[in-house]
Interface confidence: low
């Protein structure tokens, strides 16, 4: 087998050359992908978008800030991609999913509801490593306890019921800036992926002690980039090749 002979030769030449070989293979693979993407987009060169523009376009949330900063560092290092690799050639990828409109959500009590998520075909239930719903809680004026509950919408039962609980949490907030809060929704996401017809969306409730709803679900004036979104980490783990 030509491939395994090549690997054996690389190993004989030492660890450092193995790194170089792997790095070169990965780089050429990524370059090929970049060319394909540009071709599909009918572009000759990659668009030059500054970090500031990206910051304005994307939600102002911690995981995205990290990604942007990571991207910026990688550019400085002439490194590549936002994919992570390990010794098993497992690749993990972070996919950010923004809410879209849903007919079912629009019907509930005649008011639009948040949120409905459509998923990329890349997200398969057995490949989900992590799934977090990020929500932004508006600032409070006095120290307060906030009770957050995420509900999954279900088809109305005979008693009119439309909800089923996903996750709940209690947190203390102090005056000042609002906060981003993440909630683990991995199990729910996996169920949605197994049974897409069950994905009718979710509802977010975040009440302070006085009953004020602090969750930004439909951003108002000055709330751009504060939409809820899903951060999904997926993995692709091919079998480890024998050496």
């Amino acid at each position: 087998n030509e491939n395994s002979e090549q690997k054996e030769n690389v190993e004989k030449e030492g660890l450092c050359n193995a790194c170089t070989w792997r790095q070169n293979t990965k780089s050429s693979r990524i370059e090929a992908i970049k060319i394909q993407i540009l071709s599909k987009l009918r572009l000759e060169t990659a668009p030059n978008i500054s970090k500031d523009v990206i910051r304005q376009l994307l939600p102002k949330a911690p995981p995205l800030r990290e990604l942007i900063d990571q991207y910026d560092v990688q550019r400085d290092d002439s490194s590549d991609g936002s994919l992570e690799d390990d010794d098993y050639h497992a690749t993990t990828e972070t996919i950010i999913t923004m809410p879209t409109e849903s007919d079912f959500l629009m019907q509930v009590d005649g008011k639009p509801k948040c949120c409905f998520f459509k998923f990329s075909s890349k997200i398969q239930y057995n490949k989900v490593v992590k799934a977090q719903l990020w929500i932004y809680l508006r600032p409070v004026e006095t120290p307060t306890t906030v009770f957050v509950q995420i509900l999954r919408l279900i088809k109305p039962m005979k008693d009119g019921t439309r909800y089923t609980g996903i996750r709940s949490l209690k947190l203390d907030m102090n005056p000042g800036t609002g906060i981003w809060q993440s909630i683990d929704v991995k199990t729910v996401l996996q169920n949605w992926l197994k049974q897409p017809e069950s994905n009718l969306g979710i509802e977010i409730k975040a009440l302070d002690e006085n009953g004020h709803d602090l969750a930004v679900t439909f951003p108002g004036p000055g709330e751009d980039g504060l939409n809820p979104f899903l951060e999904v980490k997926v993995t692709d783990t091919p079998k480890r090749s024998r050496r």
């Epitope: 009590d109 306890t145 009770f147 509950q149 509900l151 039962m157 008693d159 019921t161 909800y163 089923t164 609980g165 996903i166 996750r167 709940s168 949490l169 209690k170 199990t187 509802e203 409730k205 009440l207 002690e209 006085n210 009953g211 709803d213």
Partner: antibody, heavy 127, light 113 residues
């Protein structure tokens, strides 16, 4: 059908700590959205909500008036929720109930009403 | 904290007649996002734990006779027993489940006249 049973001492002395156990049987509380609450009722008086924990996460809420004296914990392997109340006083003499909202998922948020109650355990605080 | 006030404290009604119990909350228990009133009604007989009759202000709990009904919104609520039966003699409590700490009314004792 889930049933709840409270257990604990019938008599405690003033300043002592009360430990009550709520044992869940006949079903599982493992599905998301299951909440176990403690509620008490002094003889001939109204009901008073004490605390809540959800079964599958670490959320606990206490009645703010009693927060400094209460601790709620759970042992899911034993299907038990334990309430401890420190510095007991004769005014704490009451029947203590644990209550649960079965399938709270389907009805609303936070276990807002309780359809399963234990029979209650009467606790007298006296020297 | 939300304070729940029930009236009357006690009520004597003839068999087959209508019984009406009122409950007032010190602040609204209506959650605007889902348009639900987080108010429940319970029946308690001597030596027994409370039994849930009504949740969400007007939804009848499974297995509860339909002579029981709940109404109201915001801060004012009513439990009605349309035709009082002997087995309805009990103390009735309202409870808000909107904000912590949850709170109960003082109770209304229903007797037969």
């Amino acid at each position: 059908q889930v049933t709840l049973r409270e257990s604990g001492p019938a008599l405690v002395k003033p300043t002592q700590t009360l430990t009550l156990t709520c044992t869940v049987s006949g079903g599982s509380l493992s599905s998301g959205g299951s909440y176990v609450n403690w509620i008490r009722q002094p003889p001939g008086k109204a009901l008073e909500w004490l605390a809540m924990t959800d079964w599958d996460a670490d959320n606990i809420v206490y009645n703010s008036a009693l927060k400094s004296r209460l601790t709620i914990s759970k042992d899911t392997s034993k299907n038990q929720v334990v309430l401890t109340m420190t510095n007991m006083d004769p005014v704490d003499t009451a029947t203590y109930y644990c209550a649960h909202r079965q399938n709270v998922d389907s009805y609303g948020y936070w276990g807002d009403a309780f359809d399963i109650w234990g029979q209650g355990t009467m606790v007298t605080v006296s020297s | 904290d939300i304070v729940m006030t029930q009236s009357p404290d006690s009520l004597a009604v003839s068999l087959g007649e209508r019984a009406t119990i009122n409950c007032k909350s010190s602040q609204s228990v209506l959650y605007s996002a889902d348009n639900k009133n987080y108010l429940a009604w319970y029946q308690q007989k001597p030596g027994q734990p409370p039994k849930l009759l009504i949740y969400d202000a007007s939804s009848l709990e499974n297995g509860v006779p339909d002579r029981f009904s709940g109404s109201g919104s915001g801060t004012d609520f009513t439990l009605t027993i349309s035709s009082l039966q002997a087995e309805d003699v009990a103390v009735y409590y309202c409870q808000q489940g909107h904000l912590f700490p949850y709170s109960f009314g003082g109770g209304t004792k229903v007797e037969i006249k």
